[in-house]
């Protein structure tokens, strides 16, 4: 089949990095600068992606593969192939329409990206709060109150954090 196809279509012999040039009797011409073809038999080369502004070049474009971008420090990639760069916030914050805002009481974000999430509700699992939550950290759930009955081994909770919070009950 391949042999038949190449007899019918001379372009199928053009390797990656070239294109089948109709203006030159369908001979294989190298991709022009700033373009590439990642597969053989192509009639055109694709324009290389340019990493501009907050996008920086992670991998240069070659005649056979597109450039790859990532984000400049202070930003992180979103979307397939890093199609967007989003500004980082601090831990304990989330990016809103009005910029980086502190997490509301009862929520936390332990990363520089993403949204603030509610503290774990320890009581739903029949447990008690061992360490209070903060804007940057979730609560730590400890043994259930029943497990801490007299005679049972108890856990001494550490000193409260600087910004103590309580798990929403």
């Amino acid at each position: 089949f391949e042999r038949t196809r190449s007899l019918q279509d001379p372009c199928s012999n053009c390797p990656a990095g070239t294109f089948c040039d109709n203006n030159r009797n369908q001979i294989c011409s190298p991709c022009p600068p700033n373009s590439f073809s990642s597969a053989g038999g192509q009639r055109t080369c694709d324009i290389c992606r340019q990493c501009k502004g907050v996008f920086r070049t992670r991998k240069e474009c070659s005649s056979t593969s597109n450039a790859e971008c990532d984000c400049t420090p202070g930003f992180h990639c979103l979307g397939a192939g890093c199609s967007m760069c989003e500004q980082d916030c601090k831990q304990g914050q989330e990016l809103t329409k009005k910029g980086c805002k502190d997490c509301c009481f009862g929520t936390f974000n332990d990363q520089k990206r993403g949204i603030c999430r509610p503290w774990t509700n320890c009581s739903l699992d029949g447990k008690s709060v061992l360490v209070n939550g903060t804007k940057e950290r979730d609560v730590v759930c400890g043994p259930s109150p029943a497990d801490l009955s007299p005679g049972a081994s108890s856990v001494t909770p550490p000193a409260p954090a600087r910004e103590p919070g309580h798990s929403p009950q």
């Epitope: 967007m84 760069c85 989003e86 500004q87 990016l95 980086c100």
Partner: nanobody, 122 residues
Framework: EVQLVESGGGLVQPGGSLRLSCAAS????????MSWARQTPGKGFEWVSG???????YYTESVKDRFTISRDNSKNTLYLQMNSLRPEDTAVYYC????????????????WGQGTQVTVSS
């Protein structure tokens, strides 16, 4: 071909003012959201301000009440009026299209100018 050309940068004393301009061509400016970013050697890139085609404006916290973004669709020009300038505002300022309409987010299809240097120093 899309072109964004910034101008108006320079050296200014703390407390002073500058007005940056960005002349746009090669696309329908009036229906495009636009933004300003800045880049400092120490802090890297920072999203500064954005304006929707309808005129709604957005600012990063550190420039609120000091900077004003505006646009003149008849002149295809974006502006950034910078008042009460501080040494920490020293940066290269870039004009960019803002297709995502999301604070602090640019997409690969957005276009960028070459930047204009703003230096705030006594």
């Amino acid at each position: 071909e899309v072109q964004l050309v910034e101008s108006g940068g320079g050296l200014v004393q703390p407390g002073g003012s500058l007005r940056l301009s960005c002349a746009a061509s090669g696309f329908t400016f009036s229906s495009s959201a636009m933004s300003w970013a800045r880049q400092t050697p120490g802090k890297g890139f920072e999203w500064v301000s954005g304006i929707y085609s309808g005129g709604s404006t957005y600012y990063t916290e550190s420039v609120k009440d000091r900077f004003t973004i505006s646009r003149d669709n008849s002149k295809n020009t974006l502006y950034l009026q910078m008042n009460s300038l501080r040494p920490e505002d020293t940066a290269v300022y870039y004009c960019a299209t803002w297709g995502t309409l999301r604070f602090g987010v640019w997409a690969e299809y957005d276009h960028w100018g070459q930047g204009t240097q703003v230096t705030v120093s006594s």
